[in-house]
């Protein structure tokens, strides 16, 4: 049940990431650690790297408020789960600083890709033999 709540939150975050992608020109063009091709069992560690990244509004134009609200939603801590707790103790996952740094557009694309991977794994895990290739 806790894991379900977590994944439902991930699905909602995809929408927020997609909204932010519309305002990518209004974000500070800073390079941020952006995990890609995350190894199995390091998804939650990579997720926390995305959450910790200093994504910021460039404070220009009329979009500042909506951008800041969206960034705040992205950073909101999800409810704790056993899977998340187990992964926190994995010392083999790369540190956030070790991931390649990318500008906001690629950062958001990689964040979305990780969220999709986590949801897909969750959906597949409760279906016998669902993965076809």
């Amino acid at each position: 049940q806790g894991q379900d709540r977590h994944m439902i939150r991930m699905r909602q975050l995809i929408d927020i990431v997609d909204q932010l992608k519309n305002y990518v020109n209004d974000l500070v063009p800073e390079f941020l650690p952006a995990p890609e091709d995350v190894e199995t069992n390091c998804e939650w560690s990579a997720f926390s790297c995305f959450q910790k990244a200093q994504l910021k509004s460039a404070n220009t134009g009329n979009n500042e408020r909506i951008i800041n609200v969206s960034i705040k939603k992205l950073k909101r801590k999800p409810p704790s789960t056993n899977a998340g707790r187990r992964q926190k103790h994995r010392l083999t996952c790369p540190s956030c600083d070790s991931y390649e740094k990318k500008p906001p557009k690629e950062f958001l694309e990689r964040f979305k890709s990780l969220l999709q991977k986590m949801i897909h794994q969750h959906l597949s895990s409760r279906t016998h033999g669902s993965e076809d290739s």
């Epitope: 049940q1 379900d4 439902i8 699905r11 909602q12 995809i14 929408d15 997609d18 694309e109 979305k112 890709s113 999709q116 949801i119 897909h120 959906l123 597949s124 409760r126 279906t127 669902s130 993965e131 076809d132 290739s133």
Partner: antibody
């Protein structure tokens, strides 16, 4: 705003292979999941399957033996092949995007495929 | 496979009416439910995902609720453009499955 458009023959003979292509415009196919759903005349919607931009697939077990979904990122297209068709495969076929993996947020308008000799 | 049962199969209503459509899953699906609107010859449109989250650009008169096996789509004040067929879809497990649809007709 992403748009999807199905294309392919509207008439297929029994025992042959149904082939449809979905062209994606206004967005890149190199992210998200891309699926096919069909609706037989007078019936409800049936999920056929989907493919991720990286090529991993999930199919409806009821069709799995006969279905192949593939993606061509260079053309921004993905396609459906359904082999050994019968009259029961007559339906409107929709292609759709699943950004959220669990639901379909953009659809094509659908194309009617009739299986008949 | 998880079976999705919608009721009613059709409903006649007038502009301004409150319309409620229900969807029942054959087993618990948490909040993994989406609602779509479909008009003849048009592309289906996602209205609600994860039971109650409104898809971007969808009017706030549409709302979704429920969890487990019983779900509801409510249109608070029916507009002329809302006459269509509505489908629910579960995403708790593969294969993804749809309800049989509810047609909202003009009274």
């Amino acid at each position: 705003q992403v748009q999807l458009q199905e294309s392919g023959p509207g008439l297929v003979k029994p025992s042959e292979t149904l082939s449809l292509t979905c062209t994606v415009s206004g967005g890149s196919i190199s992210s998200d999941f891309w699926g096919w759903i069909r609706q037989p005349p007078g019936k409800g919607l049936e999920w056929i399957g989907y493919i991720s931009s990286r090529g991993s697939t999930n199919y409806n077990p009821s069709l799995k033996r006969r279905v192949t979904i593939s993606v061509d990122t260079s053309r921004n297209q993905f396609s459906l092949k359904l082999s050994s068709v019968t009259a029961a495969d007559t339906a409107v076929y929709y292609c759709a995007r699943s950004a959220g993996v669990t639901d379909f947020d953009a659809w094509g308008q659908g194309t009617l495929v009739t299986v008949s000799s | 496979d998880i079976q999705m049962t919608q009721s009613p199969s059709s409903v006649s209503a007038s502009v301004g009416d409150r319309v409620t459509i229900t969807c029942r899953a054959s087993q618990g699906i948490s909040s993994w439910l989406a609602w779509y609107q479909h008009k003849p010859g048009k592309a289906p449109k996602l209205l609600i995902y994860v039971a109650s989250s409104l898809q971007s650009g969808v009017p706030s008169r549409f709302s979704g609720s429920g969890s487990g096996t019983d779900f509801t789509l409510t249109i608070s004040s029916l507009q002329p453009e809302d006459f269509a067929t509505y489908y629910c879809q579960q995403a708790n497990s593969f294969p993804l499955t749809f309800g049989g649809g509810t047609k909202v007709e003009i009274k």
